[in-house]
């Protein structure tokens, strides 16, 4: 199809080379309660839309998504050569940050419903390179967290290291619907809920003699409680002893609630003692079984492949650890009579 | 408790301006937005426009775009909502609401409602 | 602007019955809908917020359902402080828009 008559949109991804970011597009096609795709805006450029047409994931009509070869070459289907970039109905996220994102990517309807609609199409120009390391040594992270009932603020990485007075208009995004009443370079949230978790999206007009540009930068905001002040509690085994047939295979299960912790690096390994002697045994990996708000439950099993006189004698000792402290619990193995 | 109270009733001619104003009691004021809804004699509830008390941005309703100016106060923790070139058709009892959730978020609601001012635009 | 229409308009009820009001949005909103309550000479009170919770402080016999574009007001045993209009509200883009209003009246 004929991309000329696209609107085109230019857009800076200044990506830090310190940390892992994604990137969002969005295609902004016009209002969806219009009878077609396409219609002339009512806003001028300097206006923003209320809200990003078709944020509501159950409700958005399909868009496709190409990438504009620099060569002149016809247009490729985003999904097809791009395992790093995923089509999120009418958004487009980028995984990983590089040079090679740079390009032309273009979105349109994927149901034409009449001709007029073959030249609803975005086009969206986007350079991509790495942020100076000069430019600024503490600016925000792409990854901030909320502590739960307390205050906190979420500060757009591409303008952390400008004060409130000089930051230009930045025009803020929340899951892909525009935050219309905010514009500083930091939201600062009074009390914060676990609604406040979400994909912020950040952006500011950079201009320069030639042309003006659009700044975007994104944010994955979680709301945490704050870090436990326990150490992990081991939910099983609970008894201490175990009943066990000889010559039969035997899985014995670890499983532990750890609570939340920001830095978390829950340890969960298996010893065997026996009598003077204590290893550590090599048991598949520890698995999470249940994640919340609060705390995480850890499995880890050992197996053994028959049980035999031996093992009556050893005791099998789960060790659990987080940065307070650590916990263990013995089991025996007696035979079945 | 979480209490809304406007200014009293307000008599204006045809193209004269009226401002209302909203004092905001039992929360922190900045922390929520504030909705302006009116409603014209017998008839439906009607959006004006939103105030974010924190940074005075607005969003205001097209029909009342150029007309309407919404401010705060954050010392006397006060909202106002000023309509100019009045006519009347803008005779209506008008409501101060506060957004129902912490900002910034997707609207949720108007759970606390100001008592209402009456506004009668007669020559 | 996003259109609201609530049918009916109004309905003539006696206490103990079930009553449902309808709103339909003119295009998908999603679960941003809200309802509210209002008597005579009063401001509006918020019973639902995001089309099925209900405000804290509503009686349970208050329960709203739908998404997209269709929802419904549910009041499962009117009661005698019932007798009201009722408006449904979109939340999901700015203008926010009211419905039209249903006035519930004792039979």
């Known amino acids: 199809f004929n991309i000329s008559g696209c609107s085109t949109k230019k857009l800076l991804w200044a990506y830090s080379t310190r940390s892992e970011e994604e990137f969002i597009l969005f295609c902004d096609l016009p209002e969806p309660q219009k009878s077609h795709f396409c219609h002339r805006s009512q806003l001028s450029p300097t206006q923003v839309p209320d809200h990003l047409p078709f944020t509501d994931s159950k409700d958005l009509p399909d868009v496709q998504w190409y990438r504009q070869p620099s060569n002149g070459d016809p247009l490729e289907d985003i999904r097809k050569s791009y395992p790093h970039i995923i089509q999120d109905k009418c958004t487009l996220r980028f995984l990983t940050p590089g040079v090679n994102n740079t390009g032309s990517y273009i979105c349109r309807p994927k149901m034409i419903k009449s001709p007029y609609d073959v030249a609803c199409c975005v086009k969206m120009i986007l350079e991509v390179k790495p942020q100076s390391n000069a430019s600024c040594e503490n600016s925000a992270s792409h990854k901030q967290d909320l502590l739960l009932g307390s205050t906190g603020s979420i500060s757009c990485p591409s303008l952390s290291c400008q004060s409130d007075a000089q930051s230009p208009e930045v025009t803020w995004y929340k899951n892909g619907k525009l935050l219309s009443m905010t514009r500083s370079n930091r939201i600062v949230v009074d009390e914060v809920y676990i609604y406040h978790q979400g994909t912020y999206v950040c952006d500011y007009t950079q201009s320069d003699t030639a042309s003006s540009w659009t700044v975007r930068a994104v944010v994955q905001v979680r709301t945490i409680v704050g870090d436990t002040k326990l150490k992990p509690d081991i939910l099983d085994p609970v008894e201490s002893t175990l009943e066990v047939e000889l010559g039969k295979p035997l899985t014995i299960s670890c499983k532990a609630r750890f609570g939340f912790e920001r830095v978390f690096n829950p340890v969960m390994k298996w010893y065997i003692k026996d009598a003077d002697l204590e290893w550590e045994v090599s048991v598949p990996e520890a698995k999470s079984i249940k994640s919340t708000l609060k705390d995480e439950i850890i499995e880890r099993n050992i197996i053994l492949e028959k049980v035999t006189q031996r093992d009556l004698r050893r005791t099998f000792v789960c060790f659990v650890q987080n940065s307070i402290g650590n916990t263990t619990q013995s089991v025996q193995l007696k035979e079945k009579r | 408790q979480v209490q809304l109270v406007q200014s009293g009733a307000e008599v204006k001619k045809p193209g004269a301006s009226v401002k209302v104003s909203c004092k905001a009691s039992?929360?922190?004021?900045?922390?929520?937005?504030m909705h302006w809804v009116r409603q014209a004699p017998g008839q439906g509830l009607e959006w004006m426009g939103i105030?974010?008390?924190?940074?005075?941005?607005?969003t205001y309703a097209q029909k009342f775009q150029g007309r309407v100016t919404m401010t705060r106060d954050t010392s006397t923790s006060t909202v106002y909502m000023e309509l100019s070139s009045l006519r009347s058709e803008d005779t209506a009892v008008y409501y101060c609401a506060k957004e129902g959730r912490v900002s910034p978020t997707d609207y949720y609601g108007m759970d606390v409602w100001g008592q209402g001012t009456t506004v009668t635009v007669s020559s | 602007d996003i259109q609201m229409t609530q049918s009916p308009s109004s309905l003539s009820a006696s206490v103990g019955d079930r009553v449902t009001i309808t709103c339909r949005a003119s295009?998908?909103?999603?679960?941003?809908l809200n309802w509210y309550q209002q008597k005579p000479g009063k401001a509006p009170k918020l019973l639902i917020y995001d089309a099925s919770s209900l405000q804290s402080g509503v009686p349970s016999r208050f329960s709203g359902s739908g998404s997209g574009t269709d929802f419904t007001l549910t009041i499962s045993s009117l009661q005698p402080e019932d007798f009201a209009t009722y408006y449904c509200?979109?939340?999901?883009?700015?203008?926010?828009?009211f419905g039209g209003g249903t006035k519930v009246e004792i039979k």
């Open positions: 295009q998908s909103i999603s679960s941003y």
């Open positions: 039992g929360y922190t004021f900045t922390s929520y937005y």
């Open positions: 509200q979109q939340s999901y883009s700015t203008p926010l828009t």
């Open positions: 105030i974010n008390p924190r940074g005075g941005y607005t």
